[in-house]
């Protein structure tokens, strides 16, 4: 190698200056004894290199780029050799921003996967490789005192969520949770959440069913629907409240909400509906009165109300 570039920093804040030095060794005798070192950033020649001969016979050129406005570029030093430019060395320069503080960190406890799933917003693009780590610890109190650390959770590339598996959780005890973002220009940390995984439990909705007509039960009245629901298995012993929504299948009517219904009811007669009309119904539930998150709405159940019973008109004949 005849030349070697060294830079003040290969990664800088976008728009910051950068200084580079290119040294050509003396033993490159096939070169012009007083070669002119040229600088190129990407495809563009860069003026302003200050060249000097050092005491050991090597040639050095120093350049300061006042603002690096490219997020990624190659800086090279070269010599004119004949009619072509001979590249001596090149370095990759990166520019970007330190990571912003990750925000909107929130977590859900999923009893199906037995894991705590946390997500966040990473903030603006840094233009640099930036790693995110979900960090947590167990705490007996309100997270002022740190207990055992929990293994870091590292999301897959490009993802802004991570799952802490059951073996690292302690239910009914608080955990301190935060996100750390890190790149070559710095580190930032989100505000810390302090939560009991069970207080962020997200239930799955019950399964809505048509109530099987029993011989002794009266059929539904006109404008009424009889429903039942099957509770979600992992939530059998969790106190919940539920709500139902319904709308006619045809037309532009918006959803009408009915609730709260105790999950324990397991069946319900919904009245005040239009007779002989097809309705779409959904149900959702939340842990209650303890904290939790609403489940998603259940898959739709489609039912039709019965027709209004015929009324008998008595015709009076006048003689």
């Amino acid at each position: 190698e005849c030349g070697h570039i060294s830079v003040s920093a290969p990664i800088v804040h976008l728009g910051d200056p950068i200084t580079a030095s290119c040294i050509i060794k003396q033993n490159c005798s096939h070169l012009d004894p007083e070669p002119q070192i040229l600088w190129r950033l990407g495809a563009e020649l860069q003026p302003g290199g200050r060249q000097q001969r050092l005491s050991d016979g090597t040639q050095e050129s120093i350049i300061t780029l006042p603002h690096l406005n490219h997020t990624q570029a190659f800086l090279s030093c070269a010599l004119n050799w004949g009619n072509s430019l001979q590249i001596l060395d090149q370095v990759e320069l990166r520019a970007g921003y330190p990571p912003a503080i990750p925000h909107n960190l929130s977590c859900l406890m999923n009893l199906t996967t037995s894991s705590l799933i946390c997500q966040w917003e990473p903030g603006p693009e840094t233009h640099l490789p930036t790693s995110f780590t979900l960090k947590s610890f167990k705490s007996r109190g309100n997270c002022q005192t740190q207990g055992d650390s929990i293994l870091d959770c590292v999301p897959k590339d490009g993802q802004s969520h991570c799952s802490i598996p059951r073996k690292h959780l302690l239910l009914y005890q608080n955990m301190g949770i935060w996100v750390q973002a890190e790149n070559a220009l710095g580190t930032s940390m989100s505000p810390q959440l302090c939560l009991d995984p069970m207080d962020v439990v997200k239930l799955e909705p019950p399964m809505l069913r048509t109530m099987d007509p029993s011989p002794e039960a009266a059929p539904p009245q006109a404008g009424c629907l009889q429903l039942s629901w099957e509770p979600w298995q992992p939530g059998l012993h969790i106190n919940q409240k539920c709500e139902l929504r319904h709308k006619p299948q045809r037309g532009e009517a918006s959803w009408a909400l009915v609730g709260p219904l105790p999950l324990e009811a397991l069946q319900y007669e919904l009245c005040g509906l239009l007779p002989a009309t097809a309705y779409t119904l959904q149900i959702r539930c939340i842990r209650w009165p303890l904290p939790g998150h609403w489940s998603d709405w259940s898959p739709s159940l489609e039912l039709r109300t019965t027709e209004r019973a015929p009324t008998h008109h008595h015709h009076h004949h006048h003689h």
Partner: antibody, heavy 118, light 107 residues
Amino acid sequence: EVQLLESGGGLVQPGGSLRLSCAASGFTFSLYWMGWVRQAPGKGLEWVSSISSSGGVTPYADSVKGRFTISRDNSKNTLYLQMNSLRAEDTAVYYCAKLGELGMYMNWGQGTLVTVSS
Amino acid sequence: DIQMTQSPSSLSASVGDRVTITCRASQGISSYLNWYQQKPGKAPKLLIYYASNLQNGVPSRFSGSGSGTDFTLTISSLQPEDFATYYCQQSWTYGQTFGGGTKVEIK
């Protein structure tokens, strides 16, 4: 401190009836499922029945279905087990227990012995 | 109904030994598996719930693992007060069945 105190056990003839009570204190009784678990002499634990916080759901073990009735009075913080048509195989220590949200028996009473014998 | 099979039904061990008890469910129960300790003449005591969560006040030498159908209770270093009978229980269904128990005796 959670306390569960069973009462009502004793000696009863086959075919007879008995009503067990469990007085609860130290927690908000109306928020928790409660249950009865029994243990025959020298045997393992057997789930008998449980009851949801407001009493609307009451599953039973097949061995007692139709003979035993679980109930609760949230105003009195008391759990009950009405046992009818008792058989010799119902002889056991009956434990009252408080269930957690994930179905675990978090707290247990000291137990009351029911002996069915002629 | 879900059957719970515990093994071994009894074992002899010495103080300081590592002891492992297994529990198998006849169908998948996710993580809904609890472990209890019972000493003669006493009510059972909850040790571990939801397969691996240590109940408050239970020494850290007790640990639980597994999911689906196969579960394990481990006592890392048996202490004199650990000689007792241990039961597993599934809470996946309303009918919360118990295993047959494992009696841990002094060798």
